[in-house]
């Protein structure tokens, strides 16, 4: 009988130890959750405040309607220009209208004067068709004025108030474009 009682007591003690362990684990887990929660709240707070304070375009970018433009201060070939824009979460400039073309050329006049700037336009080697980088066709009024005599790949660039074409491997400035952030405030 005594043996039976001591066995039950040992079992109860074992149970108690397991429950204490479980409680300890739970407390640890709760603390870790609270820390994670704090981190998440801080992260969200940070994101919200930066979104609240952010202007529609990043620093050193120019805004026009729904777009932001970055005018480069370095030269590069067309393909590297595209990669430089992607790095910034943008693509080479895609001119959708005469109004946009006028804004770009007007801004360039103010900023830098008469230089060459790559845009996201290139000519298909087989068909000779001009296409924007997203695969769409430019509107008839926005085709490069002169056909390049280059045997190499031909890309589009802006100079003064004209859209022209040149060997994609020549070095020029470039213009990147991304969408402006909508203000939700």
């Amino acid at each position: 009988k005594l043996l039976q009682v001591s066995t039950i007591a040992m079992q109860q003690q074992e149970k108690l130890i397991q429950q204490e362990r479980a409680l300890l684990n739970f407390t640890e887990w709760k603390r870790s959750c609270a820390l994670q929660m704090k981190y998440c709240q801080a992260f969200m707070q940070n994101s919200l405040s930066s979104a609240h304070n952010s202007s529609p375009c990043p620093n050193n970018w120019i805004q026009n309607r729904e777009s932001c433009y970055y005018v480069s201060e370095i030269w590069s070939i067309w393909h590297t220009s595209q990669e430089n824009c992607l790095k910034e979460g943008s693509t080479l400039l895609q001119i959708e209208s005469k109004e946009e073309m006028d804004f770009i050329t007007g801004s360039l006049r103010k900023i830098k004067g008469s230089y060459d700037y790559w845009v996201g336009l290139s000519q298909d080697g087989h068909s000779g068709r001009w296409l924007w980088q997203d695969g769409s066709s430019p509107s008839p009024g926005l085709l490069p004025a002169e056909r390049s005599q280059s045997a190499n790949q031909v890309c589009g660039y802006v100079k003064s108030n004209s859209l022209l074409s040149s060997n994609c491997s020549t070095w020029k400035y470039f213009i990147c474009e991304k969408y402006a952030l909508r203000s939700s405030v």
Partner: nanobody
Framework: QVQLQESGGGLVETGGSLRLSCAAS????????MGWYRQAPGKQRELVAA???????AYADSAKGRFTISRENARNTLHLQMSSLKAEDTAVYYC??????????WGQGTQVTVSS
């Protein structure tokens, strides 16, 4: 650290189609753009297609009209649907990411072979 794992490569006949996928994992908080490059034997690595965080697209001339890039934001997955494949599309295809710090990460690559 960011890890990129490509899949979907293989052997296909001329005119056939393939869909490449790239799964991104690790500390991906903010991505500026994702894209696909390819490198054929003895040639330089070239950009095939890219998509920015805003959904702006950029394709190489050789990819226009035949390839489509897409992204599943929720699953951090990038796809490249390739159709009307030609022998000259044979290459190792690499997935890439540009993060907010303008750092570029690369996958290990997946081989695409188009037999004529």
């Amino acid at each position: 650290q960011v890890q990129l794992q490509e899949s979907g490569g293989g052997l296909v006949e001329t005119g056939g189609s393939l869909r490449l996928s790239c799964a991104a994992s690790g500390s991906i908080f903010s991505i500026n753009a994702m894209g696909w490059y390819r490198q054929a034997p003895g040639k330089q690595r070239e950009l095939v297609a890219a998509i920015t965080d805003q959904g702006r697209l950029a394709y190489a001339d050789s990819a226009k009209g035949r390839f489509t890039i897409s992204r599943e934001n929720a699953r951090n997955t990038l796809h490249l649907q390739m159709s009307s494949l030609k022998a000259e599309d044979t290459a190792v295809y690499y997935c890439t990411i540009w993060d907010r710090d303008r750092q570029q990460y690369w996958g290990q690559g997946t081989q695409v072979t188009v037999s004529s």
